[in-house]
């Protein structure tokens, strides 16, 4: 392990389309990948009229967008489907939306998901 970096070995797993994709619905996913590459966790969700609907959560392969992020935060302004990634075991249990806007002050919308 590299000092100061969170190694990701497992992530919270959730799949809203578990029947169609023939997977489990919820659980803990062990993260596999090439031995020298970094591993991350991710979360994707939709905001339907203020109601949070989780799409998927799981492991994500080596991605510089996720390096050294201990929290799962979507920064893109108003995406259709929200996506965030992070490093550290189960770091995708909580996720939030914190858009990077140039003029207006960003607002944080932390979410503690409760999968159905």
């Amino acid at each position: 392990a590299i000092l100061g970096r969170s190694e990701t070995q497992e992530c919270l797993f959730f799949n809203a389309n578990w029947e169609r994709d023939r997977t489990n619905q919820t659980g803990v996913e062990p993260c596999y990948g090439d031995k020298d590459k970094r591993r991350h966790c991710f979360a994707t969700w939709k905001n339907i009229s203020g109601s949070i609907e989780i799409v998927k959560q799981g492991c994500w392969l080596d991605d510089i967008n996720c390096y050294d992020r201990t929290d799962c935060i979507e920064k893109k302004d108003s995406p259709e489907v929200y996506f965030c990634c992070c490093e550290g075991n189960m770091c995708n249990e909580k996720f939030s939306y914190f858009p990077e806007m140039e003029v207006t002050q960003p607002t944080s919308n932390p979410v503690t998901p409760k999968p159905p």
Partner: antibody, heavy 115, light 111 residues
């Protein structure tokens, strides 16, 4: 082992469209990006665009904006690249590649545009 | 999204070292450690050799190494072997907020 298997060669007329598929196996399809790259005969590699299969979010090279559409079907672990308004200069081998680092590549699909 | 600049060709004798350069801008090559190197033999798909500027892909011999200074990345192949004769491309990580771009390619001839 990780494999990306692409659809077979295509011949198209100028002005038409082509859709190339890329079926992934040996890893979790929703755990990384799929990128598309093309290579014209005797030429270099050209990045076309990328998709995040889990969110459906895409980014396209400026050159192809408006002409290329990249999609992904998570139920079949397959990514697609559709290029429209084809011209002879689009004759090339089209590759899909896994992840931001392009660590695994498909075998390539030759698309020939000819009248 | 302009293509990165590589020399068209380089050559070397077996056992020698060669270096291939890849020059870009502060927003691609100079931005973080985004540069990768690919080897392509005729009629074959490209193969990732070096990623993140200097990390060797699994299974790649340690004769291949990568480095970066400012907006120029370099691939060095030491102890040249006949099978190293191929086209080499530099490229950048693509995904999320990053767009991809490749160099024009360098033909390596082993004399």
């Amino acid at each position: 082992q990780v494999q990306l298997v692409q659809s077979g060669a295509e011949v198209r007329k100028p002005g038409s469209s082509v859709k190339v598929s890329c079926k992934a196996s040996g890893y979790t399809f929703t755990s990384s990006y799929i990128n598309w790259v093309r290579q014209a005969p005797g030429q270099g590699l050209e990045w076309m665009g990328t998709i995040n299969p889990v969110s459906g979010s895409t980014s396209y090279a400026q050159k192809f904006q408006g002409r290329v559409t990249i999609t992904a079907d998570t139920s079949t672990s397959t990514a697609y690249m559709e290029l429209s308004s084809l011209r002879s200069e689009d004759t090339a081998v089209y590759y899909c590649a896994r992840g931001g680092w392009f660590d695994y590549w498909g075998q390539g699909t030759l698309v020939t545009v000819s009248s | 999204q302009s293509a990165l600049t590589q020399p068209r060709s380089v050559s070397g004798s077996p056992g020698q070292s060669v270096t291939i350069s890849c020059t870009g801008t502060s927003s691609d090559v100079g931005s973080y450690n985004r540069v990768n190197w690919y080897q392509q033999h005729p009629g074959k798909a490209p193969k990732l050799m070096i990623y993140g500027v200097s990390k060797r892909e699994s299974g790649v011999p340690d004769r291949f190494s990568g480095s970066k200074s400012g907006n120029t990345a370099s691939l060095t192949i030491s102890g040249l072997q006949a099978e190293d004769e191929a086209d080499y491309y530099c490229g950048t990580f693509a995904g999320g907020r990053y767009y991809g771009v490749f160099g024009g390619g360098t033909k390596l001839t082993v004399l």
